[in-house]
Amino acid sequence: LGQCVTCSDKQYLHDGQCCDLCQPGSRLTSHCTALEKTQCHPCDSGEFSAQWNREIRCHQHRHCEPNQGLRVKKEGTAESDTVCTCKEGQHCTSKDCEACAQHTPCIPGFGVMEMATETTDTVCHPCPVGFFSNQSSLFEKCYPWTSCEDKNLEVLQKGTSQTNVICGLKSRMR
């Protein structure tokens, strides 16, 4: 019957024996033998390995492509990849931030419910009755109609979701 060999979490089974994995920031250059331990080598600049591994090559650091609206958020190290984010006014279109899209402004009649972030687009909502937004904006919320009554004025023109009410002097009763 074949032996069942169990290696520790920082080892791997190779040709029937447990070899040490290479630590993050390094790569394997030679498997262990009965006479020699695993040989590892540090990753070169511009490369990384994030986990204990037996990989022969380190991974290339990611390039944050400016033509795609990307910029470096966090520089890569020997143990971690470069983290990209989007330039001002743009947000990532995926979890890994592979591409960017312009923030969407809320059009007239809609107000900003949540402003855009690095990873999310603007959240807009229609202005409810009694509120309006008269411009495309990345940050303006719906504003309440002016209360003509409070100003002792009367409504000359009703408000809409896109326009404020127009107040005027009350016409004197004859």
Partner: antibody, heavy 116, light 106 residues
Framework: EVQLVESDGGLVQPGRSLKLPCAAS????????MAWVRQAPTKGLEWVAS????????YYRDSVKGRFTISRDNAKSTLYLQMDSLRSEDTATYYC?????????WGQGVMVTVSS | DTVLTQSPALAVSPGERVTISCRAS??????MHWYQQKPGQQPKLLIY???HLESGVPARFSGSGSGTDFTLTIDPVEADDTATYYC?????????FGGGTKLELK
């Protein structure tokens, strides 16, 4: 005893395709990266492509990228090199090799001649 | 690409000591390896990681060096050592081989 045996070489016209298999025995195939290295007639050695243990990562020299595909079948202990859009400069003896950062075992090689 | 430069040919007498050099265009740390290839045969690994002797290779073969300058030494040379010797680096992508040094015995 470790053995690597390449086959299916031969004469092929430019622009055509050829698939080279390499049968491995005498070791746990999935425990090793594998590679193809070629040697043009009377010339030196040239690394062509490598593949990781489970085939999830592949690496190619620039001159064959997009034309050659390295793959493996661990259940059959076989390495493959699919060569498409062949050119005269691909004429060489192709060796399959077992490797870490060096090639510790090589096949006997198979000759591929690209000529019209 | 990292270019590895080897002298093309050497001729020595059996029993002598011979050194075959390999110079890299960029530093390759100690990721340099040596192979022997006899006519009509596949290459055979002799030395790995600059100075480690491969199992089954006679102790007449030894390797040294780091960075850009490496040496394969055969001491003493035997008639059976007639072959071409190649160095190979695995520090920079793509992995490259030297042009080979043909060793002939007088």
């Amino acid at each position: 005893e470790v053995q690597l045996v390449e086959s299916d070489g031969g004469l092929v016209q430019p622009g055509r395709s050829l698939k080279l298999p390499c049968a491995a025995s005498g070791f746990t195939f999935s425990d090793y990266y594998m590679a193809w290295v070629r040697q043009a007639p009377t010339k030196g050695l040239e690394w062509v492509a490598s593949i990781s243990y489970d085939g999830s990562s592949t690496y190619y020299r620039d001159s064959v990228k997009g034309r050659f595909t390295i793959s493996r079948d661990n259940a059959k202990s076989t390495l493959y090199l699919q060569m498409d859009s062949l050119r005269s400069e691909d004429t060489a003896t192709y060796y399959c090799g077992r490797h870490s950062s060096y090639f510790d075992y090589w096949g006997q090689g198979v000759m591929v001649t690209v000529s019209s | 690409d990292t270019v590895l430069t080897q002298s093309p040919a050497l001729a020595v007498s059996p029993g002598e000591r011979v050194t075959i050099s390999c110079r890299a265009s960029d530093s390759v740390s100690t990721l340099m390896h040596w192979y022997q290839q006899k006519p009509g045969q596949q290459p055979k690994l002799l030395i790995y990681l600059a100075s480690h002797l491969e199992s089954g290779v006679p102790a007449r073969f030894s390797g040294s060096g780091s960075g850009t300058d490496f040496t394969l030494t055969i001491d003493p040379v035997e008639a059976d050592d007639t072959a071409t010797y190649y160095c190979q680096q695995s520090w920079n992508d793509p992995w490259t081989f030297g042009g080979g040094t043909k060793l002939e015995l007088k």
